[in-house]
Each structure stands twice: as structure tokens, then as C-alpha cells.
């Protein structure tokens, strides 16, 4: 059918609550394109009728709510004037929420479910709620170890829980809960977050500092090999992960089939008060689809990107 297949990460979700996934693949979806969602290679598209429990809402697929039997591989087909991309998303549904039982619960945690607070400082947790505009989210309630959070050290601000003067006792299992309204119906969304505590050392505060890249573009010829380093300084006792992502997916997972773009092995140099980490990204062969796409270096809560750009034509050659 001429569509290029792109395999996205697995999404691990809780049953009996709403879930949405947006089909975006810049720069493809930034132009005039049509997006159609399918389940398990079915020829019949997902319904666009808003009363349907599972339906397409603009570029999103929306589950109201997600159910145990909804696990599977979903495809969104992005058709442009001269291109076609088929993005595969593997959704795995788990039935139970941790506060109800430990049985059949989340068996492993993606980065979105893990957050860090910094000892002795004012810090915050974020409730990741990604839904289309048709979904209205009410105020967020926060829970720690299955009891609602109360107390003057905690303040709810939009999707964040502000925690003042973080203590060691603040580690644990948190959940954020919101009521989502869609077409007059209300649904509960509950996201689990496991929180660890880290100390800030003297060097440069607790937030890792990305020295390079600096959110900029790199001119590179089509077909060439390119290696870009991400250089990060961080405290010696940090627990932060450093990685390259594209479309919020680890590059090694995103390019799992072709292995054309890979993350390198991390190295570090130890200084008296901090470490300097380097992790590179290698483009074995730069292709047209790489241009305009932000390749993100992540280091804990810090991010920085590069965007590949075709060199401007050199008119002196003519």
C-alpha cells in the first residue's frame, strides 16, 4: 500500500478510565494531512462518532473509558499529498489500580510514572493528562500511599502538586485524580506516580545542566553520517537518566527495525563536585524524514533538542 511503517513505544494503561493518544509525527503532521486510526490491522477505521466508546477525535484516538479487552496494536495512517506513514502503537491495559490491589497491577514503570523530588527544597510533581480539546478536565486531587494529600506543605497548581521543604518521608506512591467531562458524561482519570527523593549537592543545583545541544538546528547533507553528543553536568549522587528521544520515544525503540539511528554508550568524567556525562546519537545515514524533527536529549527533568536542516544551496557553484 506504499505506507512507511513506524513502530512507537508500548503504552501501559489502567482499565476503566479514559485514555487518549495523539497521532503526531512532525514534520509530516504539520502540513496538510489526513489521519485515520485502525485497530489490529483492521481495514475498517475507528469510528468518528463521538458517542462511540472508542472513537477518533481529530488526530487523537479516544477511549471513554479504556477496557480490559482494548489491548492491542493500533495504527494511525497519516496521508499527505506525496507521502503515507503508518504509525503502530501497542496499548497494554492493566485491570487494577494499585490502591485497590497489588494483584494484576502495573508490572513496570515508564518514565512518566517515575518522578523525583529534591530533599530540603521546594519542588513539584506533574500529573500527565493528555487529552483532546473535546475533553474538559476538572480540578486535580492528589493522593499519597492511597490517602488524599492534605497539609500546608502541599499546593495544587493546575496539573502540578507543589511540595515545599521536601523531606525523606515524601517518597512513596502518589496518584493524581481528575474528573474528565466529554459530551456531558463524566469519567475519572487516575494516574499513578512513584516518587523518589534525591539530595541536591553543591554543584549547580539539583537540575542537570545540558551543556550541549542548546535547542538549535544543525545543517547536514542528505545521506551523510552524523554523530551528535549530548553533554550534561550533574551532581555526583544523581539518579537521573540520560537518553535521546524522538516523538517522546527512546530513539533505539523508535528505530528498532532499521537501527539507522542509535543512542551510544554513556561515558562520564568525574570532577570534584560534579560529573560530566556524554551520550551520543548516531545517524548512520541522514534521510529526508529526519529534517525538521526535534531529537531531544533528556537528562532528568532537563531537555534540549537538535533539529536537522538541509544546508542552504550554495549559489557560487552555478
Amino acid at each position: 500500500d506504499g505506507c512507511k511503517d513506524i513502530f512507537m513505544k508500548n503504552e501501559i494503561l489502567s482499565a476503566s478510565q479514559p485514555f487518549a493518544f495523539n497521532c503526531t509525527f512532525p514534520p509530516i503532521t504539520s502540513g496538510e494531512v489526513s489521519v485515520t486510526w485502525y485497530k489490529n490491522s483492521s481495514k475498517i477505521p475507528v469510528s468518528k462518532i463521538i458517542q462511540s466508546r472508542i472513537h477518533q477525535d481529530e488526530t487523537w484516538i479516544l477511549f471513554l473509558p479504556m477496557e480490559w479487552g482494548d489491548s492491542g496494536v493500533y495504527q494511525c495512517v497519516i496521508k499527505g499529498r506525496d507521502s503515507c506513514h503508518r504509525i503502530h502503537v501497542n496499548l497494554t491495559v492493566f485491570e487494577k489500580h494499585w490502591c485497590d490491589t497489588s494483584i494484576g497491577g502495573l508490572p513496570n514503570l515508564s518514565d512518566e510514572y517515575k518522578q523525583i523530588l529534591h530533599l530540603g527544597k521546594d519542588d513539584s510533581l506533574t500529573c500527565h493528562l493528555h487529552f483532546p480539546k473535546s475533553c474538559v478536565l476538572g480540578p486535580i486531587k492528589w493522593y499519597k500511599d492511597c490517602n488524599e494529600i492534605k497539609g500546608e506543605r502541599f499546593t495544587v497548581l493546575e496539573t502540578r502538586l507543589l511540595v515545599s521543604n521536601v523531606s525523606a518521608e515524601d517518597r512513596g506512591n502518589y496518584a493524581c485524580q481528575a474528573i474528565l467531562t466529554h459530551s456531558g458524561k463524566q469519567y475519572e482519570v487516575l494516574n499513578g506516580i512513584t516518587v523518589s527523593i534525591t539530595e541536591r549537592a553543591g554543584y549547580g543545583g539539583s537540575v542537570p545542566k545540558i551543556i550541549y545541544p542548546k535547542n538549535h538546528s544543525i545543517e547536514v547533507q542528505l545521506g551523510t553520517t552524523l554523530i551528535v553528543d549530548c553533554n550534561v553536568t550533574d551532581t555526583k549522587d544523581n539518579t537521573n537518566l540520560r537518553c535521546w528521544r524522538v516523538n517522546n520515544t527512546l530513539v533505539d525503540d523508535y528505530y528498532d527495525e532499521s537501527k539507522r539511528i542509535r543512542e551510544g554508550v554513556e561515558t562520564h568524567v568525574s570532577f570534584r563536585e560534579h560529573n560530566l556525562y556524554t551520550v551520543n546519537i548516531t545517524f548512520l545515514e541522514v534521510k529526508m524524514e529526519d529534517y525538521g524533527l526535534p531529537f531531544m536529549c533528556h537528562a532528568g527533568v532537563s531537555t534540549a533538542y537538535i533539529i536537522l536542516q538541509l544546508p542552504a544551496p550554495d549559489f557560487r557553484a552555478y
Epitope: 494483584i103 494484576g104 497491577g105 502495573l106 513496570n108 512513596g172
Partner: antibody, heavy 119, light 108 residues
Framework: QVQLVQSGAEVKKPGASVKVSCKAS????????MHWAKQAPGQGLEWIGE????????NYNQKFQGRVTMTRDTSISTAYMELSRLRSDDTAVYYC????????????WGQGTLVTVSS | EIVLTQSPGTLSLSPGERATLSCSAS???????LHWYQQKPGQAPRLWIY???NRATGIPDRFSGSGSGTDFTLTISRLEPEDFATYYC?????????FGQGTKLEIK
């Protein structure tokens, strides 16, 4: 390091009740579910139920429902399992075991408590 | 409930030999939720392999786990004297949690 220390052996008469304790240390007691399992002499393991120490929510194996009560005292980081209307086939070693968020398996076990039911 | 059946009940082998322990589930179990424990007489069980194929901390690499759906296997490539014990498989997918009846690995 993480430790689950259980109370000592008990001898009970049929029809009586027994309450076994499990004292946790080395981690945040209120963050993990505590489970209980039974192992009769020379037999395999049987799951009894679980309790969340912070919310006190419990889930029991239907086989033990009505005879088992799980409680906790967060001030001393201790979980309890009480079994009532004891019968001779309740003679067993009882274990507590802990389950962490995102890790649905028993990584830590108590040393076990032998309960003997005999007239 | 999910019934786990282990085979054989007893396995008699000599040190240096390869051991294969099987665990069969009455209905499909996600690989994330199938675990193995080792137990020696008078001791509490100890987590040995979690999520089908991951060795717990300190478990030697002669132990490996595999399988999916309803059939799971624990393999010991070369038996050492300290490996002789009873091994239980267990599922954490649905309530009630269940264990296999155990495979006793004894010295021949």
C-alpha cells in the same frame, strides 16, 4: 536493609483464634502491600490475602473469607493476620511477604510463624 | 482461579547436570506476572526469577527462565550442590494468587 520479623510459634486449640504479627523495617511501611501465605507441613504455598498499610484496604482469598482478618498498626510498622475458628488443617507455617509498586512479586518474606492446632 | 501445575513433582539429578522444571497454567498468564521461588527446608521461600525470565538479585546466571501464555520453564544449566531445593512457580495476574505445588530437586 529490608526486614520482616514475625512473631513466635503458637499452639492453639480447635475453635480458638490466633493473631500473627509481622514487623517491618528498612522501608516505608505504608507504601507497600503486605500479603500473607500459608504452608501446611510438607505442602505447597497458599495465598491468604493482602492489606495496604496506609489505607487499611484488604483483599482476601475466598477460601479464608469470614475467618481471616488483616489489620495493621502504622505507629509500630506492624501488620497482623488473625485466623479464627481454628481447625486441625490450619496447622501450618504462616508467612508475611511484601509487594512494591510496579513490582508485582514477593521480593521479601518474613521468616514464618508455625501455628499448631491441636486438642 | 488460575491453577498452576508443576512437573515433575520430584527431579533426581546429579551435580553438573542440566535441570528443566515446568509450570503449566490453566489459563494464559502474562509473562510479567509469572515468578519462581526457591525454598529450602525450614526456610522461607526466596524470590528466584521474576517476570518469567529476570533473575532476582544475587541469583547466578546458570538459572534462566522462559515461556509465555500457559507454559513456563525454569532451567538450571549446570547443577551445583546448593541448587537442590524445592522450586515454586507463582502467578500474580489475578486473584486469588496461586502457586504451583512445587518441584523438589534432589541429589541422585
Amino acid at each position: 536493609q529490608v526486614q520482616l520479623v514475625q512473631s513466635g510459634a503458637e499452639v492453639k486449640k480447635p475453635g480458638a483464634s490466633v493473631k500473627v504479627s509481622c514487623k517491618a523495617s528498612g522501608y516505608t511501611f505504608t507504601s507497600s502491600w503486605m500479603h500473607w501465605a500459608k504452608q501446611a507441613p510438607g505442602q505447597g504455598l497458599e495465598w491468604i490475602g493482602e492489606i495496604h498499610p496506609n489505607s487499611a484496604k484488604t483483599n482476601y482469598n475466598q477460601k479464608f473469607q469470614g475467618r481471616v482478618t488483616m489489620t495493621r498498626d502504622t505507629s509500630i510498622s506492624t501488620a497482623y493476620m488473625e485466623l479464627s475458628r481454628l481447625r486441625s488443617d490450619d496447622t501450618a507455617v504462616y508467612y508475611c511477604a511484601r509487594v512494591d509498586y510496579g513490582k508485582p512479586w514477593f521480593a521479601y518474606w518474613g521468616q514464618g510463624t508455625l501455628v499448631t492446632v491441636s486438642s | 482461579e488460575i491453577v498452576l501445575t508443576q512437573s515433575p513433582g520430584t527431579l533426581s539429578l546429579s551435580p553438573g547436570e542440566r535441570a528443566t522444571l515446568s509450570c503449566s497454567a490453566s489459563s494464559s498468564v502474562s509473562s510479567s506476572y509469572l515468578h519462581w521461588y526457591q525454598q529450602k527446608p525450614g526456610q522461607a521461600p526466596r524470590l528466584w526469577i521474576y517476570s518469567t525470565s529476570n533473575r532476582a538479585t544475587g541469583i547466578p546466571d546458570r538459572f534462566s527462565g522462559s515461556g509465555s501464555g500457559t507454559d513456563f520453564t525454569l532451567t538450571i544449566s549446570r547443577l551445583e550442590p546448593e541448587d537442590f531445593a524445592t522450586y515454586y512457580c507463582q502467578q500474580f495476574q489475578s486473584s486469588p494468587l496461586t502457586f504451583g505445588q512445587g518441584t523438589k530437586l534432589e541429589i541422585k
